[in-house]
């Protein structure tokens, strides 16, 4: 039987709040990342964020994740324009803000 | 551990159908994507079906579409694959693999295998 | 139907640099993936999104991506590393998977 898009989104979720969860040092130590504008294609422009981020295995899965709700591949360095200009934050504020929104998506049932 | 049992392989004559299962354990078959790969003797993968994680579009390579129908029971976390009009060129070692997570799964990556398991199709 | 297409060996010395090559049409504007098998053992995953090691695979494993060529390189071989080689990549609802490369650690 077809299994509804739901279960997907709800594993990304569950990582981003073991990774919030688990933070003990400072996530990705303290790494700056683009913020984005969270109203619409929102997995693309996280993924475009994050990807710049390297050797920070917490956050490896999540990057990894992100490419599964993303139709296009996506390289270091690439920015769309739901890029916030000239803004950046560090990564754990970043999944915090992203994680906020994933579940505010999950409750209306915007899946994809 | 995450770790996916294959079953249901076998000989068979051609013409002939088998189902194959796969099992899964230690992690939501559900949320992912499931796929099989085959590999005939001394050669290389190939791979033959897909079923999406996100809902549940099925893929498949020319060579087995309209004779192979992948299908996935969420409750006992098993991945099918239904085999029918069997050819010779069928016999190969069939691999039940994790797939991606999300509607496109295929840009994450097959993770986890299974052992796999033998398909003789020979009269 | 989408191609992947890779030399049927590679040799190399202990110690030396491999270096497995994998041509497609425009290859570089999708992931590519390697895998791993060893004879009589199911494939292992050993560079995701052309370039990335998933844990627990060694640093010595390495990949790159661009233009019609996707290359998995293994710097400082060892006698382990022997084994086929295959890249794996999507196009059109598919996935293709390339001919395979025997690495031999001579």
């Known amino acids: 039987s077809p299994v509804p898009p739901s279960t997907a989104l709800k594993e990304l979720i569950e990582e981003l709040v073991n990774i919030t969860q688990n933070q003990k040092a400072p996530l990705c130590n303290g790494s700056m990342v683009w913020s984005i504008n969270l109203t619409a294609g929102v997995y693309c422009a996280a993924l475009e964020s994050l990807i710049n981020v390297s050797g920070c295995s917490a956050i490896e899965k999540t990057q990894r994740m992100l490419n599964g709700f993303c139709p296009h591949k996506v390289s270091a360095g690439q920015f769309s324009s739901l890029r916030v200009r000239d803004t950046k934050i560090e990564v754990a504020q970043f999944v915090k803000d992203l994680l906020v929104h994933l579940k505010k998506l999950f409750r209306e049932g915007q899946f994809n | 551990e995450v770790q996916l049992l294959e079953s249901g392989g076998g000989l068979v004559q051609p013409g002939g159908s088998l189902r194959l299962s796969c099992a899964a354990s230690?992690?939501?078959?559900?949320?992912?994507?499931g796929s099989w790969v085959r590999q005939a003797p001394g050669k290389g993968l190939e791979w033959v079906s897909a079923f999406s994680g996100s809902g549940g579009s099925t893929y498949y390579a020319d060579s087995v579409k309209g004779r192979f129908t992948i299908s996935r029971d969420n409750s006992k976390n098993t991945l099918y694959l239904q085999m029918n009009s069997l050819r010779a060129e069928d016999t190969a070692v069939y691999y039940c693999?994790?797939?991606?997570?999300?509607?496109?799964?295929?840009?994450?990556?097959?993770?986890?295998w299974g052992q796999g398991t033998t398909v003789t199709v020979s009269s | 139907s989408y191609e992947l297409t890779q030399p049927p060996s590679v040799s190399v010395s202990p110690g030396q640099t491999a270096s497995i090559t994998c041509s497609g049409d425009k290859l570089g504007d999708k992931y590519a993936f390697w895998f791993q098998q060893k004879p009589g053992q199911s494939p292992v995953l050993v560079i995701y999104?052309?370039?990335k090691r998933p844990s627990g695979i060694p640093e010595r494993f390495s990949g790159s991506n661009s233009g019609d060529t996707a290359t998995l390189t293994i710097s400082g071989t060892q006698a382990m590393d022997e084994a086929d080689y295959y890249c794996?990549?999507?196009?059109?609802?598919?996935?293709?998977f390339g001919t395979g490369t025997k690495v031999t650690v001579l």
């Open positions: 230690g992690f939501t078959f559900s949320s992912y994507a």
């Open positions: 693999v994790q797939d991606g997570l999300g509607p496109y799964f295929y840009n994450y990556g097959m993770d986890v």
């Open positions: 794996q990549a999507w196009d059109s609802s598919t996935y293709v």
């Open positions: 999104h052309d370039s």
